[in-house]
Amino acid sequence: LECYSCVQKADDGCSPHRMKTVKCGPGVDVCTEAVGAVETIHGQFSVAVRGCGSGIPGKNDRGLDLHGLLAFFQLQQCSEDRCNAKLNLTLRGLNPAGNESAYEPNGAECYSCVGLSREKCQGSMPPVVNCYNASGRVYKGCFDGNVTLTAANVTVSLPVRGCVQDETCTRDGVTGPGFTLSGSCCQGPRCNADLRNKTYFSPRIPPLVLLPPPTTAAPSTRAQNSSSTTSTAAPTTTTSIIKPTTAQASHTSPHEMDLEVIQEEGASLSGGAAGHGGTAGHGGAAGHQDRSNMEKYPGKGGAQIPAKGGS
């Protein structure tokens, strides 16, 4: 079996000229293409993989919503030579991308990573955006997380930061077959520089805090290892959370998928694949049905086979 092969992070690797073909190994009987698109109120991007897969031919589409971050996952597996170029990897222009001045900022301010590499989305490096309310939803929280796509024996992951509806979520995630969007939320200006180690506290168990001594002369002691900051609107003394050392799980690692669920959906990402090719980076996926700009998605899309050449 011969399949197309590429790995796309955000805006490049499955771009038109960068397609490769690979011969699959023995026992590999399907070609795979999987696309995961993420849309924030300030833009959208996708990750995608094409290559040799395993499992059964079929399609799987899924729309997901994580606190106002919208994700759409598409998986297509097929058993003919070079059949895995049916999904539309082309990014549609986001409304209101480039027209955000038309929206009234709501006061929240977050770091934004939309299709940025991990190197460009570190700490306070990424651009800062003003949050605004969209489609009747209030976006006053900030998010720091990752989108991860695993297919054809390849895992691609990109950071995601931006404005969300929730201000307190901790290591929340939504998943599709081989696809995960997960992260944590926070409240306060530019609070989402690094929420990887944000600790989950049950609402019924109050967090352990250090109370400052009852004197105004000496500054309060801060926890040195805290990377999450709590901000309060009321003029009370700011306290730092002491994080249990056992709660260091990071949201950067992808979730394992339940393969039985995937099989029921009609396509599987399990198993190995013959060598993948291509390099990181292009596009956007078609498809979720939320927000006010539905019309910009061409559904499941299709290969852009040229109608004819010439000028």
Partner: antibody, heavy 117, light 112 residues
Framework: EVQLLESGGGLVQPGGSLRLSCAAS????????MSWVRQAPGKGLEWVSY????????YYADSVKGRFTISRDNSKNTLYLQMNSLRAEDTAVYYC??????????WGQGTLVTVTS | QSVLTQPPSASGTPGQRVTISCTGS?????????VHWYQQLPGTAPKLLIY???KRPSGVPDRFSGSKSGTSASLAISGLRSEDEADYYC???????????FGGGTKLTVLG
Amino acid sequence: EVQLLESGGGLVQPGGSLRLSCAASGFTFSNAWMSWVRQAPGKGLEWVSYISSSGSTIYYADSVKGRFTISRDNSKNTLYLQMNSLRAEDTAVYYCAREGLWAFDWWGQGTLVTVTS
Amino acid sequence: QSVLTQPPSASGTPGQRVTISCTGSSSNIGAGYVVHWYQQLPGTAPKLLIYDNNKRPSGVPDRFSGSKSGTSASLAISGLRSEDEADYYCAAWDDRLNGPVFGGGTKLTVLG
């Protein structure tokens, strides 16, 4: 029908600047990767620059890196090539080309840039 | 010097079969990247002739076919016609140059 119409070419002195435009119609421009490809008189095709649909990924040929800037305005369905520090060897017909399925499936008619003193 | 190597010229008589070769390296064709062929008639813009190694856009006659093997590709034209007289270019992505590269072009002359 897909149409790509280049403009902005002309005669310029070495060291000078020109800005080429390519007006696109007949397809969803904001979906398409676009490129500039040039052809010196009597010579072969040479790829110049490449821009993704959103404009966030850009590539340049080594021969123009640092001198040429590709950009696009999806609201105007227009592709641009800003050419600075022009040299005699930049003299060519400049084509704008659309990326289809892994190939340049549509080309403009080209605009001639002549760099001479 | 083009990254992809093509013979500068080729010729044939009407009805004949002509093949044009395109030789690359491990950073382009040999890396698995698909090959495309363009036809440029005199005084006109290039036109896509073959994409993805061996696929024809609609409107291109089946007299034109493409193939690829290892670090090389070839374009075959059977039943040669006078209107096939043109320059033919191969193209593929190149990892080293991080962009698409073209062959130097082959000028096809239809004799007689």
